[in-house]
């Protein structure tokens, strides 16, 4: 498993500020988990990277995942002046120059190498929880979020806002 | 034009219960959770939960886990808060807000209801 | 719960001060935290969100401050309109708690 280390953390601070065009309102280094506590953990495999989701021995150094914010025009925005309407997006990247991206063909959440500026399938929407877990949502396929399946992440369709709270598209975010 | 309108002031007994309403207009009502938060003469601001219109969830602050009730009725984009077993100390201002950000907390209030004064009195 | 602290609790200033009003939270938020103005009978107004990220609307004499755990409001040169009550508030995780609230007064 591959992380970023705490002086990576800095040396590659908002990744040449520009990932869009705009610069994210902040970044933050976190180990993702699923809502029952299982790690998202990252392998270099036949020279690429794949994507797990496993429960880590004791004492096993959680991987570390790079959240990047950015605000974003929510396409509902009924108002068209710009003030209604704000979204949350994030990208998520757990080693330099790759990136989380969503492939929506192959309901399949895949790690790129890309250049900036990111394509739209490496953003999502993000939804916090009264749990305080959060969920991410495709940009480019609203009500498709990254979700647990078969011990990977996959892209799961939320059929109905009822499920908006299903516990495999729920995820914590923590420092250590 | 966002507006977030509510009912007017009510005046209760010790032991009774009030139900306040704020009627959404000017956004899609269930792309963001509605909260409720208070304000008693002269004090600051305390937050009592809030409720998610796409799917009724609902959080509540733990000093109003018991007495308070927060729903919704998605034909007319309107909210509602309940408090039971009102007490003197309930006398506040009660607001309704909408968060800034869709789907999230993280950008605070943006859009908040006039207020609506329950006074609790004997 | 998140326990969000201010002050001072109220301070007096005259027209053309600079006024600051810090604001601590009681565990990392990053920079989640926005700053609303109240003035009496009425309802709060956002003014700052993200920290730094001024409200549509909003003078540009106002500014914030701060991520993880400390945050400031800074007015560059107090109006005769900025008189009021400023709360903070943190967004990061519920229950979502607001500061006790700083007033500023005419000196």
């Known amino acids: 498993a591959f992380g970023i280390s705490g002086v990576q953390k800095y040396t590659r601070a908002l990744h040449d500020s520009s990932i869009t065009g705009i610069s994210p309102i902040t970044e933050y280094l976190a180990s993702l988990s699923t809502y029952n506590d299982q790690s998202i953990t990252f392998a270099l495999e036949d020279e690429s990277y794949e994507i797990y989701v496993e429960d880590l021995k004791k004492d096993e150094k959680k991987d570390k995942v790079l959240l990047s914010y950015y605000e974003s025009q929510h396409p509902s925005n009924e108002s068209g002046d710009g003030v209604d309407g704000k979204m949350l997006m994030v990208t998520l990247s757990p080693t330099k120059d790759f990136w989380l991206h969503a492939n929506n063909k192959e309901h399949s959440v895949e790690l790129h190498k890309c250049e900036k500026p990111l394509p739209d399938q490496a953003f999502f929407v993000l939804h916090n929880m009264h749990s305080n877990c959060v969920s991410f949502e495709c940009k480019t396929d609203p009500g498709v979020f990254i979700g647990v399946k078969d011990n990977h992440l996959a892209l799961i369709k939320v059929d109905s806002s009822e499920n908006l709270c299903t516990e495999n598209i729920l995820f914590k975010l923590s420092e250590t | 034009e966002v507006q977030l309108v509510q009912s007017g002031a009510e005046v209760k007994k010790p032991g009774a219960s009030v139900k306040v309403s704020c009627k959404a207009s000017?956004?899609?009502?269930?792309?963001?959770?509605m909260n409720w938060v208070r304000q008693a003469p002269g004090q600051g601001l305390e937050s009592i939960g809030d409720i998610n219109p796409k799917n009724g969830d609902t959080f509540y602050n733990q000093n109003f886990k018991d007495r308070a009730t927060l729903t919704i009725d998605k034909s007319t984009s309107t909210a509602y808060l309940e408090l039971s077993s009102l007490r003197s100390e309930d006398t506040a201002v009660y607001y309704c807000?909408?968060?800034?950000?869709?789907?999230?907390?993280?950008?605070?209030?943006?859009?908040w209801g006039q207020g609506t004064l329950v006074t609790v009195s004997s | 719960d998140i326990q969000m602290t201010q002050s001072p609790s109220s301070l007096s200033a005259s027209v053309g001060d600079r006024v600051t009003i810090t604001c601590h939270a009681s565990?990392?938020?990053?920079?989640?935290l926005s700053w609303y103005q109240q003035k009496p009978g009425k309802n709060p107004k956002l003014l700052i969100y993200a920290a730094s990220k001024l409200h549509t609307g909003v003078p540009s004499r106002f500014s914030g401050s701060g991520s993880g755990t400390d945050f400031t409001l800074t007015i560059s040169s107090l109006q005769p309109e900025d008189f009021a009550t400023y709360y903070c508030q943190q967004g990061q995780s519920y229950p979502l708690t607001f500061g006790q609230g700083t007033k500023v007064e005419i000196k």
């Open positions: 807000a909408r968060h800034y950000y869709y789907g999230s907390s993280y950008g605070g209030f943006v859009y």
């Open positions: 000017g956004y899609t009502f269930s792309d963001y959770n």
């Open positions: 565990q990392n938020i990053n920079v989640w």
